[in-house]
């Protein structure tokens, strides 16, 4: 592989590494969405909640804005966190006054784990390709990274649908919502992993024939 190609591959892998870190952060943190109910009349607080793939945290938040709205409050201070019942059946999460969309939550978590799996396998391939000059391993690595990105965006969409259903459901008190930084991390990770995977595939392909009399066999040999 030429010097310029190697440089391009390394830059691409750096962006993929950043995407992988963002994906990991998104999966393990609880700030995918923030939900808040109507402002209670007897006290100017919101029982706001933020949740991720595995658990939900609630916190009472004082409302200081002029219109006394619960919208766009940020849960902070003392929090109560609990893993979703289907991930920890022994734990009671009554205090959270929350109906989870079980199927959505399980699906989003499972798909996100697949994404991390693809990132790990892709990284192994990329590492081996550098270690022993097996450049051909960059191709499966790029595919794994692209698949990881796709899994992540599917997980994001499943979570989006979950939030929509929770807000629309008559069986929850949540009336307002916005997507938070874990969600942004997942979206950024998708972009970096998917595009990084595609670029890596492009850079790792053998040079295409540039003249009519050349064949693929004439392309520079791979180590």
């Amino acid at each position: 592989m030429s010097q310029t190609k190697t440089a391009k591959v390394r830059v691409t892998l750096f962006f993929i590494l950043v995407g992988g870190v963002l994906a990991m952060v998104a999966v393990v943190t609880d700030h995918w969405a923030v939900l808040s109910p109507h402002l209670e009349h007897h006290n100017e607080t919101c029982e706001a909640a933020h949740f991720g793939l595995w658990r939900i945290c609630t916190a009472r938040v004082a409302v200081h804005n002029k219109d006394k709205s619960c919208e766009h409050v940020t849960p902070s201070g003392e929090k109560n966190c609990s893993y979703f019942r289907h991930f920890n059946p022994g734990e009671s999460s009554e205090i959270f006054e929350f109906t989870t969309q079980k199927e959505y939550s399980i699906s989003a978590a499972a798909i996100a784990i697949f994404s991390l799996g693809f990132i790990i396998v892709g990284s192994i391939c990329a590492f081996l390709s550098f270690g022993n000059k097996r450049d051909y391993l960059l191709r499966p690595a790029s595919m794994f990274y692209a698949f990881a990105g796709l899994c992540l965006i599917v997980s994001v969409e499943v979570m989006r649908q979950s939030v929509k259903r929770m807000i629309d459901s008559e069986d929850t008190v949540w009336i307002e919502h916005y997507y938070s930084w874990s969600f942004a991390c997942a979206c950024a990770a998708f972009i970096l992993l998917f595009l990084g995977g595609l670029f890596l595939l492009l850079f790792s392909l053998p040079r295409m024939p540039q003249n009519p009399w050349e064949s693929c066999m004439d392309a520079e040999p791979e180590h």
């Epitope: 109507h38 402002l39 008559e170 008190v173």
Partner: antibody, heavy 116, light 108 residues
Framework: QVQLQESGPGLVKPSETLSLTCTVS????????WTWLRQPPGKGLEWIGY???????NYNPSLKSRVTISVDTSKNQFSLKLNSVTAADTAVYYC??????????WGQGTLVTVSS | EIVLTQSPGTLSLSPGERATLSCRAS???????LAWYQQRPGQAPRLLIY???NRATAIPDRFSGSGSGTDFTLTISRLEPEDFEVYSC?????????FGGGTKVEIK
């Protein structure tokens, strides 16, 4: 399919306490919010308040000082108590599943008349 | 609290005609959180529409909701004999939840 049935006295004397119970069948009372509403004769509906199966409740500010909603998960029931009733509290009282949004599942309603 | 005013109080129409019921709020309803119910005498209300325009489960497509802000409309495209009942709107954009006084749709 969840079904709700209100029960309680149809006649209450002024200044006394109105007590109603809603029995839930076809589903567990757990994991859901439960609401009381009422409709005075010839008028619109009025939201009284809701309770969660864990016991936390929220009430309409106009009735808050007189109303208590409680839940008994072992009997799959929740109850309404309205103190110091007057003729203005004469209404059809409904229980429903839900809290602070719309209501898909309702009881048939029970008429409570406040009269001496 | 948000006051909901329904008009007209009574609507006299014939089967097969189009009914347009109005619900006006005293202030803007957040996220168009408005529901419509049908109520038969001696029966509990039946949810027709939520979120201003989403039809509830098993509700015929002749019922449709529209509107935003403070003005909302329930339209029944072709009145069937069983549609001649009282219709109420309810807002859930802010507490306390409030209901309109109702519109009675009667046979002309």
């Amino acid at each position: 399919q969840v079904q709700l049935q209100e029960s309680g006295p149809g006649l209450v004397k002024p200044s006394e306490t109105l007590s109603l119970t809603c029995t839930v069948s076809g589903d567990s009372i757990n994991n859901y919010y439960w609401t009381w509403l009422r409709q005075p004769p010839g008028k619109g509906l009025e939201w009284i308040g809701y309770i969660y199966y864990s016991g936390s409740a929220n009430y309409n500010p106009s009735l808050k000082s007189r109303v208590t909603i409680s839940v008994d998960t072992s009997k799959n029931q929740f109850s309404l108590k309205l103190n110091s009733v007057t003729a203005a509290d004469t209404a059809v009282y409904y229980c429903a599943r839900g809290a602070v949004k719309y209501f898909r599942h309702w009881g048939q309603g029970t008429l409570v008349t406040v009269s001496s | 609290e948000i006051v909901l005013t329904q008009s007209p109080g009574t609507l006299s129409l014939s089967p097969g005609e189009r009914a347009t019921l109005s619900c006006r709020a005293s202030q803007t309803i957040n996220h168009n959180n408005l529901a419509w119910y049908q109520q038969r005498p001696g029966q509990a209300p039946r949810l027709l529409i939520y979120g201003a325009s989403n039809r509830a489960t098993a509700i015929p497509d002749r019922f449709s909701g529209s509107g935003s802000g403070t003005d909302f409309t329930l339209t029944i495209s072709r009145l069937e004999p069983e549609d001649f009942e009282v219709y109420s709107c309810q807002q859930y954009g802010s507490l306390p939840l409030t209901f309109g006084g109702g519109t009675k749709v009667e046979i002309k």
